[in-house]
Each structure stands twice: as structure tokens, then as C-alpha cells.
Interface confidence: medium
Amino acid sequence: MMTGTIETTGNISAEKGGSIILQCHLSSTTAQVTQVNWEQQDQLLAICNADLGWHISPSFKDRVAPGPGLGLTLQSLTVNDTGEYFCIYHTYPDGTYTGRIFLEVLESSVAEHGARFQIP
């Protein structure tokens, strides 16, 4: 039975040209996290594999940095980066947990950032 829950940074906004941290946190389960995928719509951005470490998609290697933790840092944001992002936790024995984040990249110089939380 899957008992875990995923907390995310929720809906966030950032300024064009800036950077943003996408974070998810899996709690309420003792399952082992074997891999975390970060995806944007149908595109794979990055993978953090428990055995192999971080792999960044070649298409995004110039603008995506691993971490902090299992999170992902997006840099040099453009308006085209606006959209849904998913953290997909592959766990054993529970299975797969998915979290959703919506990012809005704003043209203006003032961007309200959503609530952040620290991952211990």
C-alpha cells in the first residue's frame, strides 16, 4: 500500500533571465527512493539515480543544474519555460509517486516567488 505523500513548491513564478529551484519532498513512507525523474510536459529534464547519481538531459545541460538535494535548479529562464513540471519518485517497494509544480516566467522585473521550504 502506498502511504507516502509528495510536498512540492506548488505554483511559483520567476523573472525572465533569472533562476528558480524546483523542489519536491517525499514523506510518510519508509520506501527506498531508487530514482527521481524531473520532467516538463513530455520532456525529460534530469534524473537522479540512487546508484548512478545525476544525469542531465543533453538538451538542457546548459540551463539545468542538479540540486539542492533531489531538487532541480533552472537557470537563464525564458517565457517558454512557463508550464508544468513533474517530479517522479521511483520507490521500492511502494512504486511511483508524482508531484506537480507550475512555473510562470514573468517578463516584468517583479516576480512573486511562491512559498519555499527547506529539505533537511
Epitope: 530514482q35 534524473i47 539515480n49 540512487a50 546508484d51 547519481g53 544525469h55 521500492y92
Partner: nanobody
Framework: EVQLVESGGGLVQPGGSLRLSCAAS????????MGWFRQAPGKEREGVSA???????TYSDSVKGRFTISRDNSKNTLYLQMNSLRAEDTAVYYC???????????????????WGQGTLVTVSS
């Protein structure tokens, strides 16, 4: 940290067979796919075959029907059975590991960041 060690290379006559092995150690979960690559003298490294998520397999056109990839999870070992070998199969063969995901069944080396040291296969009469 995952470490990969290949073995089984050597000298074989055209038309002959070899079986390469790649032993994996240092893993915690084994949640990754594995592939075989080769690099001939003076040429770029190219993909040969891979075992992907769901146990699917893929082969380059040049080896399809002659080579067979397999994986024994109980022994943490990847194999490449090579039959009907040709002179153009001469190369250093490498095994490599990459994260497991549903779109991973290709032979691009981009996602492979963990490599063995290679084993030399020479096909010559």
C-alpha cells in the same frame, strides 16, 4: 559507486563467436539499464546494443541478427553473445550503465556516464 568490469575479449577468426561479460559492483538497487558500445581504431565510439526498461532490447543495424544482449540480475552481469564475427567488428568493447526510464531504449551515449575500462575484440584470420 557503480563499477563495471568487462571480460571475454580476444582474438577470433572471421565467422567465429565470442561472449563478452560485464560485471557490475558497488550498486545499491540495480535500477539502471545497460548497454554495449565499441570503438574501432581511429573511429568514434558507437552503440552496439542495450537492455532497456521492461527488459526490451535494441541493436545497431550492423550487428542485428548476429549479436544477442542479455542480463543476469542474480549475478549482476551483462552479456553480449557475438556470432558470425567479421573483421569490421574489431574494436574495444565497453559496457555502460544509465538511469532507467521509459524512453531509454536508444543507443545514444549521452545518458551513459558510467563506463567500464573496455575489452579488446580482434577478428582476424
Amino acid at each position: 559507486e557503480v563499477q563495471l568490469v568487462e571480460s571475454g575479449g580476444g582474438l577470433v577468426q572471421p565467422g567465429g563467436s565470442l561472449r563478452l561479460s560485464c560485471a557490475a559492483s558497488g550498486y545499491k538497487y540495480g535500477v539502471y539499464s545497460m548497454g554495449w558500445f565499441r570503438q574501432a581504431p581511429g573511429k568514434e565510439r558507437e552503440g552496439v546494443s542495450a537492455i532497456c526498461s521492461g527488459g526490451r532490447t535494441t541493436y545497431s543495424d550492423s550487428v542485428k541478427g548476429r549479436f544477442t544482449i542479455s542480463r543476469d540480475n542474480s549475478k549482476n552481469t551483462l552479456y553480449l553473445q557475438m556470432n558470425s564475427l567479421r573483421a569490421e567488428d574489431t574494436a574495444v568493447y565497453y559496457c555502460a550503465a544509465r538511469p532507467l526510464w521509459t524512453g531509454d531504449c536508444d543507443l545514444s551515449s549521452s545518458w551513459y556516464k558510467t563506463w567500464g575500462q573496455g575489452t579488446l575484440v580482434t577478428v582476424s584470420s
